[in-house]
């Protein structure tokens, strides 16, 4: 199930997925002056089985000598409703694929790719927040957001992060200072079904990752 909205926006912060759940889709977008090749992939799709996940399709861009068109009018069987967008950041540091079953790594850049990426996330996806350069993180709780399904609708949990305008960049994830005692998640879950997946795995994985996964510019 696709998430109906983007992850929450936090002033002076960016978010990043450490890995992408199966079903996630990434638009094949090209920078100005370029277009997808004829009959080229419209998007990449994270697919896999119990032992291995990878991105199906490859995005390819070519010069826009003619207008940006792609001929393909028959929906493919694997096409499914999807959703999400994120500002494009540098591909993350490599993650051991075995550490996060059912997830794909950040796709490598393709030639003449657009300067931002638009992802379409699925329920259970977790993203992590970091203050932009020049801002410092104050925490009330986890600096992360999870797409959950409640009462048949999707929503993102609210990350407990405030970025203050002090000229100091924080480490990520965890270890920001000053940091108040975590209060736990602010959402009070009701008695209806809540669908969450992989939270513990992703949190543990995040805690062991290098902190330099964000960059301010995409090369």
């Amino acid at each position: 199930e696709l998430c109906d909205d983007d992850p929450p926006e936090i002033p002076h912060a960016t978010f990043k997925a450490m890995a992408y759940k199966e079903g996630t889709m990434l638009n094949c977008e090209c920078k100005r002056g370029f277009r997808r090749i004829k009959s080229g992939s419209l998007y990449m799709l994270c697919t896999g089985n119990s032992s291995h996940s990878s991105w199906d399709n490859q995005c390819q861009c070519t010069s826009s000598a003619t207008r940006n068109t792609t001929k393909q009018v028959t929906p493919q069987p694997e096409e499914q409703k999807e959703r999400k967008t994120t500002e494009m950041q540098s591909p993350m540091q490599p993650v051991d694929q075995a550490s996060l079953p059912g997830h794909c790594r950040e796709p490598p850049p393709w030639e003449n790719e657009a300067t931002e990426r638009i992802y379409h996330f699925v329920v259970g996806q977790m993203v992590y927040y970091q203050c932009v350069q020049g801002y410092r993180a104050l925490h009330r709780g986890p600096a992360e957001s999870v797409c959950k399904m409640t009462h048949g609708k999707t929503r993102w949990t609210q990350p407990q992060l405030i970025c203050t305008g002090e000229m100091e960049t924080s480490q990520f994830p965890g270890e920001e200072k000053p940091q108040a005692s975590p209060e736990g998640r602010p959402e009070s879950e009701t008695s209806c079904l809540v669908t969450t997946t992989d939270f513990q795995i992703q949190t543990e994985m995040a805690a062991t990752m290098e902190t330099s996964i964000f960059t301010t510019e995409y090369q």
Epitope: M25, C28, T74, R83, A114, I118, Y119, H120
Partner: nanobody, 123 residues
Framework: QVQLVESGGGLVQAGDSLRLSCAAS????????LAWYRQAPGKEREFLAA???????LYADSVEDRFTISRDNPKNTVHLQMDSLKPEDTAVYYC?????????????????WGQGTQVTVSS
């Protein structure tokens, strides 16, 4: 509440041009495609063109040489420039919004529809 409102339809002569517009409101459409479909009397609704937030486009074979889709993100509008119109282009033209990347979504699966605008091309 999402609303899609089409405008620009009308009666034109074969060979003429027409520009349809659709104003979208009620949510952020950054990760939605905006698209145009049409439905002629007695026929199924037909995909024409779609465009993403970053201007990636997709056209149906039947119109790709004559129709051009464009998008104005700050105004949440999408346009369909239709040139060299033919009598067989006569139909009700619908604006649509759908989650996900540019792709030819089958009409029953589209998330949001406008009410449609009539285009009639006389010979």
């Amino acid at each position: 509440q999402v609303q899609l409102v089409e405008s620009g339809g009308g009666l034109v002569q074969a060979g003429d041009s027409l520009r349809l517009s659709c104003a979208a409101s009620g949510r952020s459409f950054r990760n939605y495609i905006l698209a145009w479909y049409r439905q002629a009397p007695g026929k199924e609704r037909e995909f024409l063109a779609a465009i993403s937030w970053l201007d990636g486009t997709l056209y149906a074979d039947s119109v790709e040489d004559r129709f051009t889709i464009s998008r104005d993100n700050p105004k949440n509008t999408v346009h369909l420039q239709m040139d060299s119109l033919k009598p067989e282009d006569t139909a009700v033209y619908y604006c649509a919004a759908d989650r996900g990347p540019v792709r030819p979504v089958l009409a029953p699966d589209v998330d949001y529809w406008g009410q449609g605008t009539q285009v009639t091309v006389s010979s």
